[in-house]
Amino acid sequence: IWELKKDVYVVELDWYPDAPGEMVVLTCDTPEEDGITWTLDQSSEVLGSGKTLTIQVKEFGDAGQYTCHKGGEVLSHSLLLLHKKEDGIWSTDILKDQKEPKNKTFLRCEAKNYSGRFTCWWLTTISTDLTFSVKSSRGSSDPQGVTCGAATLSAERVRGDNKEYEYSVECQEDSACPAAEESLPIEVMVDAVHKLKYENYTSSFFIRDIIKPDPPKNLQLKPLKNSRQVEVSWEYPDTWSTPHSYFSLTFCVQVQGKSKREKKDRVFTDKTSATVICRKNASISVRAQDRYYSSSWSEWASVPCS
Amino acid sequence: RAVPGGSSPAWTQCQQLSQKLCTLAWSAHPLVGHMDLREEGDEETTNDVPHIQCGDGCDPQGLRDNSQFCLQRIHQGLIFYEKLLGSDIFTGEPSLLPDSPVGQLHASLLGLSQLLQPEGHHWETQQIPSLSPSQPWQRLLLRFKILRSLQAFVAVAARVFAHGAATLSP
């Protein structure tokens, strides 16, 4: 058993049929010694008396808010949550496996630049009695500070018969060094509590690996005289790290016909312009990627050929 | 060539070679063998490798003030990785394919390090850590980890030379 926060405790249980459970001793936070009784949740049934209460925690029915009283007055509370371990593996019932980029990916994170600011998100089908708490650091043995905000519900989607809820959180490294080569990964830890079930999820990454630039901005076409060719130009996104002579991007320019089946013409360039042939009803799209490190491409910025 | 102690490196040549190194480091990575282990190998093998850190002067301001600190750090790293790529980790079982980009990568690391350091001047280099793989699967794991680490290192080096070529070239 360990303390999650004041008066909230997590009991770690090996979860299998006929498991013996864990013996837990609760102590009433009071100077009083006599006449103390214990109850669980809203029940008035007295579970025991005395300053300490010993219970065998085996299942969710044994978890909940234990309260010690004296003469009708509440003295203190202890909320017991359960953390299940099945066949040596901690349960992951609360969050959905996003399966990208690999199985058992519950948290996904992205950064728009090298400033040390990043966003993480996760999915669940649970709509009520759900709380999240997020902590982060650079490295784990001698952790350096990363400040995270509160997790918020950022999207709701309908997937078949189920509703899916996306939560996200923004974090900022306290003393970021954008130009340095990261040697210690960022660690993100999410505590999830649903009713009386506790779970924790972690992700470990380098900012360089979660970089996804915003799409190029001000995408423009300039027809070339007496030609089907056009000059496409664009600019670095505002959110990208500066100076651009140091934090350089590379670009992919694509000409795509109306039909998805039509052949795509692609050009790769380090410049912020390119000359392409504009076909009727086609569109021109440009996306960006860090020039020197193959992290994610940005989403496409697009303009119609006409 | 970079002359430690004042004159500038051949920024444009360094830029071109460092960008080539980036491409080679990424093309070599998937080709050192099928690898599930990399998903689980969570402990850092790269604690002993020379990283380009915050105080090394490789940021735009530091390069403007005095690029020598940064260039020395980059040189140190290039020599270090060049030695690793020539070690038993990459030459031992399992054998790399004859046309593996690791050979080219090895040569390019040496080429860039020679551009940075003229004959007769020696910056101190770092000892290769003893990673002591005894099994082929351990070598394979280390190859992935070393190449991942090298990708990060050469990305910073390439940024330095690109910025130098754009803003510091005579």
């Epitope: 040596g88 593996i89 | 063998g33 099928h34 690898m35 599930d36 282990l37 689980e40 190998g41 969570d42 402990e43 850092e44 093998t45 079982e93 399992p94 054998s95 793989p133 005894s134 099994q135 082929p136 699967w137 351990q138 394979l140 794991l141 280390l142 980890k145």
Partner: antibody, heavy 121, light 111 residues
Framework: QVTLKESGPVLVKPTETLTLTCTVS????????ISWVRQPPGKGLEWLGV???????NYNSGIKSRLTISKDNSKSQVVLTMTNMDPVDTARYYC???????????????WGQGTTVTVSS | DIVLTQSPDSLAVSLGQRATINCRAS??????????MHWFQQKPGQPPKLLIY???NLESGIPARFSGSGSRTDFTLTISSLQAEDVAVYYC?????????FGGGTKVEIK
């Protein structure tokens, strides 16, 4: 379908040399390492040695001086030679494939049925 | 050599109940976060069969009631609900250092 089949003498006299051949199919010896493991009657398993994809070998130090493992990739055959046999070498000898280096980290994923070798005069 | 000590030597468990086998190594069998510990099942007259590789990965075709856990020196094989066909001897094996070594085996029977 992956198979490994051991063949060789069933009976060997003390001081003689044992030669066992392992013939594999369903995979190439240039892609997978082969180990030899033995099991004395009613006892546990003992690893003898391995031949890697590139032809290099590692042996159990306890019997290294008596052991040679070689292979012929084109014939898909691995040969175990063990000199100066003794009655304590009586065991079932297994030819075993080591799983893909990058996934299995030295786990042996396919075993032959084994061949029982008795050392007796 | 790395010595692997299995416990218990033998185990009698009722059908449908949980069976747990431990394997302790005389030194760590981890290499940069990868545990080179593997588990095998051997039935009478048959060669050993790989169940779990790298401490916790289930070999394809093996029922999900088998699971493995642990790292460094302490490892566990669990059969969550014992079936009649699970009666066998179970071995752990390390491949972190030469020579590869096996545990002494644990015989699992029906109670």
């Amino acid at each position: 379908q992956v198979t490994l089949k051991e063949s060789g003498p069933v009976l060997v006299k003390p001081t003689e040399t044992l030669t066992l051949t392992c013939t594999v199919s369903g995979f190439s010896l240039t892609s997978y390492a082969i180990s030899w493991v033995r099991q004395p009657p009613g006892k546990g398993l003992e690893w003898l040695g391995v031949i890697w994809t590139g032809g290099g070998t590692n042996y159990n130090s306890g019997i290294k001086s008596r052991l040679t493992i070689s292979k012929d990739n084109s014939k898909s055959q691995v040969v175990l030679t063990m000199t100066n046999m003794d009655p304590v070498d009586t065991a079932r000898y297994y030819c075993v494939r080591e799983g893909d280096y990058g996934s299995y980290a030295g786990a042996m994923d396919y075993w032959g049925q084994g061949t029982t070798v008795t050392v007796s005069s | 050599d790395i010595v692997l000590t299995q416990s218990p030597d033998s185990l009698a468990v009722s059908l449908g109940q949980r069976a747990t086998i431990n394997c302790r190594a005389s030194e760590s069998v981890d290499y940069y976060g990868i545990s080179s510990m593997h588990w095998f099942q051997q039935k009478p007259g048959q060669p050993p069969k790989l169940l779990i590789y790298r401490a916790s990965n289930l070999e394809s075709g093996i029922p999900a009631r088998f699971s493995g856990s642990g790292s460094r020196t302490d490892f566990t094989l669990t059969i969550s609900s014992l079936q009649a066909e699970d009666v066998a001897v179970y071995y752990c094996q390390q491949a972190n250092k030469d020579p590869y070594t096996f545990g002494g085996g644990t015989k699992v029977e029906i109670k």
